[in-house]
Interface confidence: low
């Protein structure tokens, strides 16, 4: 659901990751988009406690930029998804081991909540930076 609005990021969980004056997409399918999206990051972050130092900053960037997507203002505000290549870099390079564990836990139903699934992008469904350089966000 891409109904929402653009707003300057005023949260806390992604403060260290997003640009200071970042314009982010807030999804109005949530009653309180700012808090709901912050909670999504928080829930996913609890699962990321034990990741490696190599994976951690990449995972932070991916999480925050996926849940608080860059927003293209206009008559219809539009979220700009992360470029597929950056998503794949996190999945296959920086966090390969952790990503496998996460997928295994998901398949085996070991997560207490399915909320984290909303926090993890499906890389294959994201636009490539080679299609249209302005259609996706670079981490």
């Amino acid at each position: 659901d891409n109904k929402g609005y653009c707003a300057q990021y005023r949260g806390e969980v992604c403060n260290a990751v997003l640009a200071k004056d970042a314009l982010v997409f807030l999804n109005t399918s949530y009653a309180d988009p700012e808090e709901a999206q912050e909670l999504l990051v928080h829930t996913a972050w609890n699962e990321l406690k034990v990741v490696s130092p190599v994976c951690r900053p990449a995972a932070e960037a991916l999480l925050c930029n996926h849940i608080f997507q860059e927003c293209s203002p206009g008559v219809v505000p539009t979220p700009i998804p992360i470029c597929r290549e950056y998503c794949l870099a996190v999945k296959e390079l920086f966090c390969a081991k952790e990503w496998l564990v996460m997928e295994e836990k998901t398949h085996r139903g070991l997560y207490r909540s399915e909320m984290h699934l909303l926090s993890v992008p499906e890389c294959s469904k994201l636009p490539s930076m080679h299609w249209d350089p302005t259609a996706c966000a670079r981490l």
């Epitope: 005023r10 949260g11 806390e12 969980v13 992604c14 403060n15 260290a16 990751v17 309180d32 700012e34 808090e35 912050e38 990051v41 928080h42 972050w45 609890n46 406690k49 034990v50 932070e60 925050c64």
Partner: antibody, heavy 120, light 108 residues
Framework: QVQLQESGPGLVKPSETLSLTCTVS????????WSWIRQPPGKGLEWIGY???????YYNPSLKSRVTISVDTSKNQFSLKLSSVTAADTAVYYC??????????????WGQGTLVTVSS | SYELTQPPSVSVSPGQTARITCSGD??????AYWYQQKPGQAPVLVIY???ERPSGIPERFSGSSSGTTVTLTISGVQAEDEADYYC???????????FGGGTKLTVL
């Protein structure tokens, strides 16, 4: 840089309500989380609760029934109310930035603290 | 209720290494934070996210994590490091904050 300053009465009678205000200067309260922490004389630290600038609150379960934290973004202040106080609530009360249960959940900076004594 | 356990006191000679531990069942899942508090002063953050050091904190302060225990290490302890040290973390479900009971570091 951001500075915090607690204010309020230093003496409260048993069974009454303790009220403190924290004024934030050098930055806007309209981001981050804002917390209250207390320290009884000669003892350790105890987290009381926090408020997000939007008004969402989380409280320590052990104090939840007596605590109210509110925010006034127009004054760049947030406040603590603790009801039905007893001598056990005598402590130095600190306000601090942070404590949001997310990526950046440390307390920094802190106010200098204000001693509140509960006595008749 | 969830608890973090610290030794009440640790003593070291100047120049030696001080290690202060903090134990809690949720520490494998939740980050730990360390604060230094000198008499009559507010606490100061010295380590965040288990092992990160804020700017302005001397390099002799470091943090590590192993299972249910996190450790604050002060290498080459100086007289000015004498203080109380508190660890902070969340319960396993991440709903409230807990502080350890504090450790008094004495520099002999």
């Amino acid at each position: 840089q951001v500075q915090l300053q607690e204010s309020g009465p230093g003496l409260v009678k048993p069974s009454e309500t303790l009220s403190l205000t924290c004024t934030v200067s050098g930055g806007s309260i309209s981001s981050y989380y804002w917390s209250w922490i207390r320290q009884p004389p000669g003892k350790g630290l105890e987290w009381i609760g926090y408020i997000y600038f939007s008004g969402r609150t989380y409280y320590n379960p052990s104090l939840k029934s007596r605590v109210t934290i509110s925010v006034d973004t127009s004054k760049n202040q947030f406040s603590l109310k603790l009801s039905s106080v007893t001598a056990a609530d005598t402590a130095v009360y600190y306000c601090a930035r942070g404590g949001g249960l997310g990526i950046s959940n440390w307390f920094d900076p802190w106010g200098q603290g204000t001693l509140v004594t509960v006595s008749s | 209720s969830y608890e973090l356990t610290q030794p009440p006191s640790v003593s070291v000679s100047p120049g030696q290494t001080a290690r202060i531990t903090c134990s809690g069942d949720a520490l494998p899942k939740q980050y730990a934070y360390w604060y230094q508090q000198k008499p009559g002063q507010a606490p100061v953050l010295v380590i965040y996210k288990d092992s990160e050091r804020p700017s302005g904190i001397p390099e002799r302060f470091s943090g590590s994590s192993s299972g249910t225990t996190v450790t604050l290490t002060i290498s080459g302890v100086q007289a000015e490091d004498e203080a109380d040290y508190y660890c902070q973390s969340a319960d396993s479900s991440g709903t409230y904050w807990v502080f350890g009971g504090g450790t008094k570091l004495t520099v002999l």
